[in-house]
């Protein structure tokens, strides 16, 4: 029988070089063998490019479209083919569907006695428009204390967060992860960065003093 698209492709752009399109088929599909997503910039003399999708679960497919860079006027036509059968036709304006790249290199610095310093890297180069527009959310939680989970919103440009060590329990491990969004581009949140684990060994001065005399 003929193949059918159950859930039409939806695409997001990283506003740099890649747009990711996901969709669901009506039944189990070998996406890379059976399907092709053709995309073409609607502009003078632009050629059609082919994306070979990958499986994303039994009926899901995902395709990573290379787009060099993106400007606000860019618009792409999308054609999903199964051999000679056109399954779906649509269009996609990357600037209107932006999902930033995830921040990287999340590091926890505990060498400052009373502060936990978290730093991470902006996922964009300085010449990208999103570079100076990203704000972040840092999620800190503890596997030892399941009740503890906090989100810290970082609304300034510098990719750092300082937390007083005294606000965390001593003698247990914590994890942190960070994600980004760009307010002026009305983006969705990025994926979370890989998490980083650290051990909070900080003790209050009076607690140390008390400990010392007993």
């Amino acid at each position: 029988g003929s193949m059918k698209v159950l859930q039409e492709p939806t695409c997001v752009s990283d506003y740099m070089s890649i747009s990711t399109c996901e969709w669901k088929m009506g039944g189990p599909t070998n996406c890379s063998a059976e399907l092709r997503l053709l995309y073409q910039l609607v502009f003078q003399s632009s050629e059609t490019h082919t994306c070979v999708p990958e499986n994303n679960g039994g009926v899901g497919c995902v395709c990573h479209l290379l787009m060099d860079d993106v400007v606000s006027m860019d618009n792409y036509t999308l054609d999903l083919w199964a051999g000679q059968q056109l399954l779906w036709k649509g269009s996609f304006k990357p600037s209107e569907h932006v999902k930033p790249r995830a921040p990287g290199n999340l590091t926890v610095h505990t060498n400052v006695s009373d502060t936990v310093l978290l730093t991470w890297s902006n996922p964009y180069p300085p010449d990208n428009y999103l570079y100076n527009d990203l704000t972040y959310a840092v999620n800190i939680w503890s596997e030892n204390d399941p009740a503890y989970s906090r989100i810290h919103n970082v609304t300034y440009l510098k990719p750092t967060l300082r937390i007083p060590a005294s606000t965390l329990k001593s003698g247990i491990s914590y994890r942190a992860r960070v994600r980004a969004w760009a307010q002026h581009y009305n983006t969705t949140w990025s994926e979370w960065s890989p998490s980083t684990k650290w051990y909070n060994s900080y003790r209050e001065p009076f607690e140390q003093h008390h400990h010392h005399h007993h």
């Epitope: 502009f43 632009s46 050629e47 860079d69 860019d74």
Partner: antibody, heavy 119, light 107 residues
């Protein structure tokens, strides 16, 4: 690092022919439109021709249409400009340039090759 | 063809000066306006594309603005290496066309 190296320039008589080449490296050549831009001695810049990433589309300035042919070899990562029926006014430094996705700007340029048309 | 009129054709300025160059298109070019820098005997270099986007590796003292038919290149604080000729170019419609150039000289 993107590198574009032109060759094939030289002195040619009016009515003669010349073939310019541009060897590209440092990027996926087959993904980008490529162009030729020229500059007559002491003058401004003039767009000559553009070819799409796969070679399906070619566009020319009116001043060279019917005389010049742009082509590319995506296996050899090389851009060409075949110039026939050359005129004195074609004398210029010819630059090959790489576009972005839109082929609206010339993002990277070669060092240029001088073509002199004179009897 | 779209005509690109650049002004001034030349200007003299000192290191540290703020310099502005304008480019007017004969019709709306929908922000597809690019700026190049060229030094004698060298190939042009792309500075700004799509009106205001800084090309990779270009110092932030260069900026672009404009819309419709009128566009501007600004150098916020002129440096010794900025003395050169600057060209605008429209990419909205074939044939692609350049402005006549602006030569920035040392005062």
């Amino acid at each position: 690092e993107v590198q574009l190296v032109e060759s094939g320039g030289g002195l040619v008589k009016p009515g003669g022919s010349l073939r310019l080449s541009c060897a590209a490296s440092g990027f996926t050549f087959s993904r980008y439109a490529m162009s030729w831009v020229r500059q007559a001695p002491g003058k401004g810049l003039e767009w000559v021709s553009t070819i799409s990433s796969g070679g399906s589309y070619t566009n020319y300035a009116d001043s060279v249409k019917g005389r010049f042919t742009i082509s590319r070899d995506n296996v050899k990562n090389t851009l060409y400009l075949q110039m026939n029926s050359l005129r004195a006014e074609d004398t210029a430094v010819y630059y090959c340039a790489r576009a972005t996705a839109r082929a609206t700007e010339f993002a990277y340029w070669g060092q240029g090759t001088l073509v002199t048309v004179s009897s | 063809d779209i005509q690109m009129t650049q002004s001034p054709s030349s200007l003299s300025a000192s290191v540290g000066d703020r310099v502005t160059i304008t480019c007017q298109a004969s019709q709306d070019i929908s922000n597809y306006l690019n700026w190049y820098q060229q030094k004698p005997g060298k190939a042009p270099k792309l500075l700004i594309y799509y009106t205001s986007r800084l090309h990779s590796g270009v110092p932030s003292r260069f900026s672009g603005s404009g819309s419709g038919t009128d566009y501007t290149l600004t150098i916020s604080s002129l440096q010794p290496e900025d003395f050169a000729t600057y060209f605008c170019q429209q990419g909205n419609t074939l044939p692609l066309t350049f402005g006549g150039g602006t030569k920035v000289e040392i005062k």
